[in-house]
């Protein structure tokens, strides 16, 4: 039985040209995490974090994706095309697969600065 739950950073926005951290956290299960896959809205793989072997960043993203912090992923040099859904897929044993969703909106610099000024802390 799958008892775990995934918490994510939810809906986030970031500035064009800037960077953003995507984070997921699996809780409420004793299952062993064997691998965490990070995927983009078009289902292309960004990176794999294997529990024993570390990180593999996909060749197409090596210039713009940095591993971490933790099991998270840092996207750099953001473009408007990076707007969309991102998924963290936790492969666990014996539970199976857990999936979390994050929606990233990349904003033009002036818009991002404007919206940031009015965010509630």
């Amino acid at each position: 039985m799958m008892t775990g739950t995934i918490e994510t950073t939810g809906n986030i926005s970031a500035k064009k040209g800037g960077s953003v951290i995507l984070q997921c956290h699996l809780s409420s299960t004793m299952a062993q995490v064997t691998q965490v896959n990070w995927e983009q809205h078009d289902h292309s793989l960004l990176a794999i974090r294997n529990a024993e072997l570390g990180w593999h960043i996909y060749p197409a993203f090596k210039d713009r994706v940095a591993p971490g912090p933790g099991l998270g992923l840092t996207l750099q040099s953001l473009t408007m095309n990076d707007t969309g859904e991102y998924f963290c897929t936790y492969h666990t044993y014996p539970d199976g697969t857990y999936r979390g969703r994050i929606f990233l909106e990349v904003l033009e610099s002036s818009v991002a600065e404007h919206s940031a000024r009015f965010q509630i802390p």
Epitope: T34, Q35, N37, E39, H43, S44, L45, I48, N50, A51, E52, L53, G54, W55, H56, Y58, P59, H91, Y93, T97
Partner: antibody, heavy 120, light 107 residues
Amino acid sequence: EVQLQESGPGLVKPSETLSLTCAVSGYSITSDSWNWIRQPPGKKLEWIGYISYSGNTYYNPSLKSRVTISRDTSKNQFSLKLSSVTAADTAVYYCARLDFSNYGGAVDYWGQGTTVTVSS
Amino acid sequence: DIVMTQSPDSLAVSLGERATINCKASQNVRTAVAWYQQKPGQSPKLMIYSASYRYTGVPDRFSGSGSGTDFTLTISSLQAEDVAVYYCQQYYTTPWTFGGGTKVEIK
């Protein structure tokens, strides 16, 4: 150039333990991942498991209760033990290196393979 | 476990002609697929990783494509030295699994 060489008995009796060693030259086993993969006659290649650069192991759940992979860094070699063997464990056994950082789960260096037959 | 199914089991192609090998995953594996070549009496050799990236030293007549569940290895102009068994493998999730192989021969 990375080179891997399997060694061990070619014949093992049912219910006994299969033991193989892989000697690695040209590269340190304290980097990357070191794997055992087998191919029974007429069947698919099957991942048995691996030992990482740090000594952590992963075993295929279908074999987990019978498998142990260990290493000897002073000899730059790693080993496979498979207990309670049956005829279904008859296969060509390969040791292999995997550079996860660059190639993900794709194996870039293989040993030449050693045939193990389980028979009384 | 994810099952990788290759087709056809064997393929006979004339020298200089195109050879196409298919691999189907039982579930979506994105682009976490590798291809290997195994010549008679030898161990497998890595040809393609991440579905479409050629490994070091692999001739450019070999190409990989696909994502999701359907993948293809193409040899654009078959050479005598390409006679071998070709295997696909997924590493989207553990345990990493292989296809059953496709034997490529010369017609």
